[in-house]
Interface confidence: medium
């Protein structure tokens, strides 16, 4: 990895061991203020592998609300608007970081947690082996 | 929202105002030890809207490495394996939380940051406006 010289103005920290507890400012800096407005917008409806979005809420987690994608069909939508079962709609999943209140119900103490979320769906060709 | 009684065993915190600084244990708890094997595997290659994965590294960020998807084509791959420009390959994007070292180069002080990442691509029908 890259070694970075430590800033002398850093807050003091007693515990230098990993796993370590760090200070985190929850005043979120959003680097996406001017992001592409074409984002995922209505792709969920216009995709050949359309999906529905489901609300996943957990007050012990930060962020407490995460939207999960669930593919609408097993197959993909063809040019005629019908489901083609020779193709497969599959979820694109990603591991993301969230903060989990620890101990539970504590407003100022968290633990980093990795969770898997389905972000949307894509249409793939199935894996098929033909007998010679 | 749901009001949760505060756990009496919580660490003390002087600043009760938001934005607040909280304690976060960086020993990540991974809830995905045995996740669905159907994950994103080789979908990036088999999708009708295939994508490439690019490494985005930033030592001032946690996690320092994030993989970004970039759609390979403007159009989508049809049944003959050719690019069909009547359809569009578009990135599925998601806002995720990361930790940004603040002040810079500090090992134990962070600020939450939202960044937009492209997770994969999906094939959509283009929006076409017809002149009346």
């Amino acid at each position: 990895g890259i070694t970075i010289p430590r800033n002398p103005g850093c807050p003091n920290s007693e515990d230098k061991n990993f796993p370590r507890t760090v200070m985190v400012n929850l005043n979120i800096h959003n680097r996406n203020t001017n992001t592409n407005p074409k984002r995922s917008s209505d792709y969920y409806n216009r995709s050949t592998s359309p999906w529905n979005l489901h609300r996943n809420e957990d007050p012990e987690r930060y962020p407490s609300v995460i939207w999960e994608a669930k593919c609408r069909h097993l197959g993909c939508i063809n040019a005629d608007g019908n489901v083609d079962y020779h193709m497969n709609s599959v979820p694109i999943q990603q591991e993301i970081l969230v903060l989990r209140r620890e101990p539970p119900h504590c407003p100022n103490s968290f633990r980093l947690e990795k969770i898997l979320v389905s972000v949307g769906c894509t249409c793939v060709t199935p894996i098929v082996h033909h007998v010679a | 929202g749901i009001t949760i009684p505060r756990n009496p065993g919580c660490p003390n915190s002087e600043d009760k105002n938001f934005p607040r600084t909280v304690m976060v244990n960086l020993n990540i708890h991974n809830r995905n030890t045995n996740t669905n094997p159907k994950r994103s595997s080789d979908y990036y290659n088999r999708s009708t809207s295939p994508w490439n994965l690019h490494r985005n590294e930033d030592p001032e960020r946690y996690p320092s490495v994030i993989w970004e998807a970039k759609c390979r084509h403007l159009g989508c791959i049809n049944a003959d394996g050719n690019v069909d420009y009547h359809m569009n390959s578009v990135p599925i994007q998601q806002e995720i939380l990361v930790l940004r070292r603040e002040p810079p180069h500090c090992p134990n002080s962070f600020r939450l940051e939202k960044i937009l990442v492209s997770v994969g691509c999906t094939c959509v029908t283009p929006i076409v406006h017809h002149v009346a």
Partner: antibody, heavy 124, light 111 residues
Framework: EVQLLESGGGVVQPGRSLRLSCAAS????????MHWVRQAPGKGLEWVAV????????YYADSVKGRFTISRDNSKNTLYLEMNSLRPEDTAVYYC?????????????????WGQGTTVTVSS | QSVLTQPPSASGTPGQTVSISCSGR????????VDWYQQVPGAAPKLLMY???IRPSGVPDRFSGSQSGTSASLAISGLQSEDEADYYC???????????FGSGTKVTVLG
Amino acid sequence: EVQLLESGGGVVQPGRSLRLSCAASGFIFSNYGMHWVRQAPGKGLEWVAVISYDGSNKYYADSVKGRFTISRDNSKNTLYLEMNSLRPEDTAVYYCAKVGASGDYYYSYGLDVWGQGTTVTVSS
Amino acid sequence: QSVLTQPPSASGTPGQTVSISCSGRQSNIGRHYVDWYQQVPGAAPKLLMYYDSIRPSGVPDRFSGSQSGTSASLAISGLQSEDEADYYCATWDDSLGGYVFGSGTKVTVLG
């Protein structure tokens, strides 16, 4: 006709081993994920393990993890379940079952073909 | 204890409609699709429904499935004596890293 035929069951003492086989016919075995599911006497269905169409991915129930091994020989159209350190609670009818769609599906199309089952009794 | 909860039993007279619920959580039904199986005594299970609500060929349209949030349900309309069996819901669970079955529901056709 699509068919699955289990064999290898029997009576075995605790701590011993047993190997179950499942012979597949009537479909392209190498295209499909395969499961083992068991059912203890008078109880419900319990999932045991799954293997991907090419054998590259294997997943197990916590109750058998580290003791049971699922494998397949696509050239012989046969699925296996190697059971070690058997316990009385492993006593059950063991079924092999085929995933309903080819490729990297493990469950989305359900388990559409089941064998008739083979009985495993673990007793001293 | 199964992570998918079903009522132990359900009953109805011929012609009636019987519904069976299957309650799970976000890591299973909330994210994945539900399968339903029918098992008559002494026989292997039979796939009755997949992808929440799709019937395999040969399954009568008296059987229907639905899913909402972290719950799913199977409805049998126009109940017939041959519907007397055990019914199991099942799906993948990301937390457990495996396929999970419900506790099972015994359907009895009365009279």
